[in-house]
Structure formats: C-alpha cells, structure tokens
C-alpha cells in the first residue's frame, strides 16, 4: 500500500481466482484512543472498533472511503483505491490502446518545435468518475524538471455504438535549449483513477522524435505567363524554432485532382517556393518536415488551383 | 528519406555539401545496422545514449546560433571566442562565428573516425561476418575533415590484444551510430546556418 495523495491510498492487488488479497491496516488520524468505530462509504454498518482497523482487501468491494468516527463525529477518512494486476499484468482498462505507432500505445505526444514544450493526449470511453494527474521529468534516475498543466477534455467523438473522449495535457521543460542534443529521454507519467480503480501509464521519448511542425503558412499561387504552370510559395509556420537557417525544414508539394484515384504529382524541396502544373479542379498542398531529422510530416496546407 | 537531392552551387559554403553527405551516410549506415542486427538491442529505445565526445569537445555550445545566445539554458558552458580559422570560412563574413565551433566539429569527426576504424577492425575478425562499416561513411568523414582543414595531431588507431567480444562490439556500434547521427544533425544545422549568414 502506498499514498497517492493526502488520505488517498493505493492497494496493489495481484488478483487471481481465490487470491488471498492484501492485508491492510488503517489508522485513525486522531489523538483519541477509545470509542472509535469504522464505516465504509455511505453504509452505517460498523466494520470494527479501535484506533486501527485491519481489513483483507480481495476485490473492489473492499475498496472505498473508510471513515473513523467517535460519538457521531467524523475523525478522519482514508480512501482506498485498487491497482490490480491480473495474469501478472497491471490493468490498463481506463485508457484505450491507440495502437499507433505500435501496440500498447496509450499516451501519444507531439511537439511543434524544439522549445521543450509538448502536448500529450489519450483516449477513453469512460465519461464519469474519472480523474487524471500528469507528472513529467527529463530522465528518471536524476530527474530534471518538466512542468505539466492539468489534463483537460479536448475532444469527443462517436465511434460506432461508443463515445470516445480525448484528454490532453501541455508540458514544458523547465530549462530547455532548442539546440541541445538530448541524451536522456522525457518521461511522462499519467495517474488515472476511475471510481476505485487506479492505473498508471507512462511514455518515454526524445523531443526530436515527436516533432511535428505546424503546416506551412501563407500558401499562395502565382500563375506564370503563357503557361499552365504556377509558382507556389509559402512560409515557415510561426510556431517553428528559430533561426530557420539552423532549424531548417524541407517541404513536400503535392498536386491532387478532385478524385482520390487521380495520380498525385509530388515535388520535394528545401526552398519555400516551387513551380508546378496546376490542373483544372486540382488543389495544391504543401507539408513540412525537419530537414535533418526525419520525424513526422506536418499536416497539409492546401489551396485550390482555380 | 528518398528525396530528390539538389546539387549545391559551386560557390556555396564548401562544408555544407560534405555535411549533407555525412548525415545521409550515417543515416543509411544506422538503418543498415538496425536491419542487420535486428535481434540485438539497436533501436533508439533500447540503447544507452552515450556521447564519446562528452567533456572533450563542446560542439553544441561552441556552434550555438547568435539568436540562441540569449537563451540561458543554452549557455551553461558557452565560450565566446570570435576568432575565425579554417578553409570553410575562406570567403565568408564570419565575425560572429567561432573558430572553436569548426575546430570542435573537426575534433568530433576525428574521435568518431578513430572509434569506427577500431571497431571495423574488430568486426572484420568476426567469423559470422555479419556487419561492417560502410566505407562510404568513413570516406565522407574524411572529406569533411579535409574541407575543415584544421591541422591537428593524428590520433593512433586503438589496438587491442584481447579477443574481441563480437556481441558487445555490435552493441557498441549501434550506440556509436545513434550518437554520431545526432551529432551529424547538429553539424548539418551549423553548416546550414553558416551558409545562410
């Protein structure tokens, strides 16, 4: 058993049929010695008396808010949550496996630049009785500071019969140098509590591997005289690291017809302009990627050919 | 990335072309190592990230762009020497850039070159003959060192009398390639920045 926060405790339960459970001793936080009784949740049934209560925690029915009283007055509370191991594996029931980039990916993180700021998000089908708390650090043995905000509900989607909820959190490394070469990964730890179930999820990454630039901005077309060609120009996104001559991007320019089946013309360039042939009803899209370290491409920025 | 590659202008900052070739060569070598050594811990998640140049060179700090010198987090060990040297700088206004930067890059390359050559000698003794260092990568390191044109003592290749542990050598190769790729990215950024200045 360990303390998650004041008066909230997590009991680690290795569950299997007929498992003996965990013996837990609760102590009433009071100078009083006599006349103390214990109850669980809203029930008035007295579970025991005395300054300590010994319970055998075998299942979720044994978890909840234990309260010690004296003469109708509440002395203290202890909320017991369960962290369950089934078949030797800690439960991961609260969050959905996003399966990208690999199985058992519950947390996904992205950074728009090298400033040390990043966003992580996760999915769940649970809509109520749910809380998250996020901690992060650079490295684990001698951790350096990363500050994370509160996790917030960022999107809701309907997936078949189910509603899916997306939560996200923003974190910032306390002293980040954009030019630094990372040798210790960022560690992100999410504590999830649903009803009386506690679970924890972790992700470990280098900022360089989660970079995804914003799409190029100010995408413009300039028709070239007496030609079907156009000059496409764009700019680096505002959120990208500076100076741009050091943090350079490379770009992919795509001409796409109305139908998805039509052949796409693609050009790769390090410049912020390109000359392409604009077909009728086609659109021109540009996306960006770090020129030197191939992490994710940005989303496309698009303009119609007409 | 299999992207069309533009050939640099002849008047371009001479080291940029070499540094681009270096990054391409080390990335290809790392990819080859990951594939060939698929049953060894050779991915970024599996290896220990060690830097053989740590405490010996200060490339990141010495080559910091001017715009980042205002960032306190980048300044732990920044040395501010604005003297210029080396043939890469021949035709450029480089008052902002330090000789320290390019000599630090040169020292990095020299250290990695020695390590790679020593390691290749061991890998050539492996009866499995599973993986060797790409000669192109070694040649590209050499070309960039020559372009940097810093005179420094030749470091003798390390020789070892004991029987090499081929498993350890292959893991060390992965560690070295990952670290060298990260350094090659920094070198490319620096050269791009110098070229634009």
């Amino acid at each position: 058993i360990w303390e998650l926060k004041k008066d909230v405790y997590v009991v680690e339960l290795d569950w299997y049929p007929d498992a003996p459970g965990e013996m837990v001793v609760l102590t009433c936080d009071t100078p009083e010695e006599d006349g103390i009784t214990w109850t669980l949740d809203q029930s008035s049934e007295v579970l025991g008396s005395g300054k300590t209560l010994t319970i055998q925690v075998k299942e979720f029915g044994d978890a909840g808010q234990y309260t010690c009283h004296k003469g109708g007055e509440v002395l203290s509370h202890s909320l017991l949550l369960l962290h369950k191991k089934e078949d030797g594996i800690w439960s991961t029931d609260i969050l959905k496996d996003q399966k990208e980039p690999k199985n058992k990916t519950f947390l996904r993180c992205e950074a728009k630049n090298y400033s040390g700021r990043f966003t992580c998000w996760w999915l769940t089908t649970i809509s109520t009785d749910l809380t998250f708390s996020v901690k992060s650090s650079r490295g684990s043995s001698d951790p350096q500071g990363v500050t994370c905000g509160a996790a917030t509900l960022s999107a809701e989607r309907v997936r078949g019969d189910n509603k899916e909820y997306e939560y996200s959190v923003e974190c910032q490394e306390d002293s980040a140098c954009p030019a630094a070469e990372e040798s210790l990964p960022i560690e992100v730890m999410v504590d999830a509590v649903h009803k009386l179930k506690y679970e924890n999820y972790t992700s470990s990454f280098f900022i360089r591997d989660i970079i995804k630039p914003d799409p190029p901005k100010n995408l413009q077309l300039k028709p070239l005289k007496n030609s079907r060609q156009v000059e496409v120009s764009w700019e680096y996104p505002d959120t990208w690291s500076t100076p741009h001559s050091y943090f350079s991007l490379t770009f992919c320019v795509q001409v796409q017809g109305k139908s998805k089946r039509e052949k796409k013309d693609r050009v790769f360039t390090d410049k912020t302009s390109a000359t392409v042939i604009c077909r009728k009803n086609a659109s021109i899209s540009v996306r960006a990627q770090d020129r030197y370290y191939s992490s994710s491409w940005s989303e496309w920025a698009s303009v119609p050919c007409s | 990335r299999n992207l069309p590659v533009a050939t640099p202008d002849p008047g371009m900052f001479p080291c940029l072309h070499h540094s681009q070739n270096l990054l391409r060569a080390v990335s290809n070598m790392l990819q080859k190592a990951r594939q060939t050594l698929e049953f060894y811990p050779c991915t970024s998640e599996e290896i220990d990230h060690e830097d053989i140049t740590k405490d010996k060179t200060s490339t990141v700090e010495a080559c910091l762009p001017l715009e980042l010198t205002k960032n306190e987090s980048c300044l732990n060990s920044r040395e501010t020497s604005f003297i210029t040297n080396g043939s890469c700088l021949a035709s450029r206004k480089t008052s902002f850039m330090m000789a320290l930067c390019l000599s630090s890059i040169y020292e990095d390359l020299k250290m990695y070159q020695v390590e790679f050559k020593t390691m290749n000698a061991k890998l050539l003794m492996d009866p499995k003959r599973q993986i060797f260092l790409d000669q192109n990568m070694l040649a590209v390191i050499d070309e960039l060192m020559q372009a940097l044109n810093f005179n420094s003592e030749t470091v003798p290749q390390k020789s070892s009398l004991e029987e090499p542990d081929f498993y350890k050598t292959k893991i060390k190769l992965c560690i070295l390639l990952h670290a060298f790729r990260i350094r090659a990215v920094t070198i490319d950024r620096v050269m791009s920045y110098l070229n634009a200045s």
């Epitope: 569950w15 949740d41 979720f60 649903h194 009803k195 | -």
Partner: nanobody, 123 residues
Framework: EVQLVESGGGLVQAGGSLRLSCAAS????????MGWFRQAPGKEREFVAQ????????YYADAVKGRFTISRDNAKNTVSLQMNSLKPEDTAVYYC????????????????WGQGTQVTVSS
Amino acid sequence: EVQLVESGGGLVQAGGSLRLSCAASGRTFSGYDMGWFRQAPGKEREFVAQISRHNSNTYYADAVKGRFTISRDNAKNTVSLQMNSLKPEDTAVYYCAIGSLFPSSRERDYDYWGQGTQVTVSS
C-alpha cells in the same frame, strides 16, 4: 443507453440445471465486466458471479462456486450463467449487470442492470 435483457429462467427441480442468458445492446459490450446478482424474497440482492472484459477471468460467490459457470460471447454481446446442481436456496430473481470494476461483489460498482428473470428450484 445500454439495455440488458435476461432470459432462461423457470421452474426446475432440485439437482437440475438451467442456463440463463443476458443480451446487451446500445454500447460496445466488450468494454465492460459482466456480472450476475440474485434476490430471494425478503432478502437483499446478493452477488453470484462476474466475468472480466479481457481475459474472461471469473469470480464467484462462495455459495455457488463449483456449481455455476459464467461465460461470455463478445461477438454476440451475451453473457451466460450455467447453473448445475441447483438447490431450493438458489430460488431468486436473477439480474444481469455490467460495470467497469473487476473483481467486485458490490452492487454499487455496477452501472447498468437488467429487469431480472425468475428462477424457482422446487424440492
């Protein structure tokens, strides 16, 4: 909203068998732990059995262990309770319930409930 409909109840002699079924609709059933409870006349509702969502691990009340078997079919969105060696004290209304806490024998840990099906065991 989730609907649970029980079926398979009836009158059976002591020592006999019955198979109860519960069909779920309205939400993806595979994301829940399923359980059966029962309520005998004049008594509190009590836990019978539960099956977990992933690996179909099972949890039984001591009174039914070795006689009752709970199983689930995620493709058909059903959970079943095979009751063998029935005793008169098994007479009750049997309720199907789903929740997100496994293992739990506590009523309030379940989110959705069926209407119940009557099982009567005569001696």
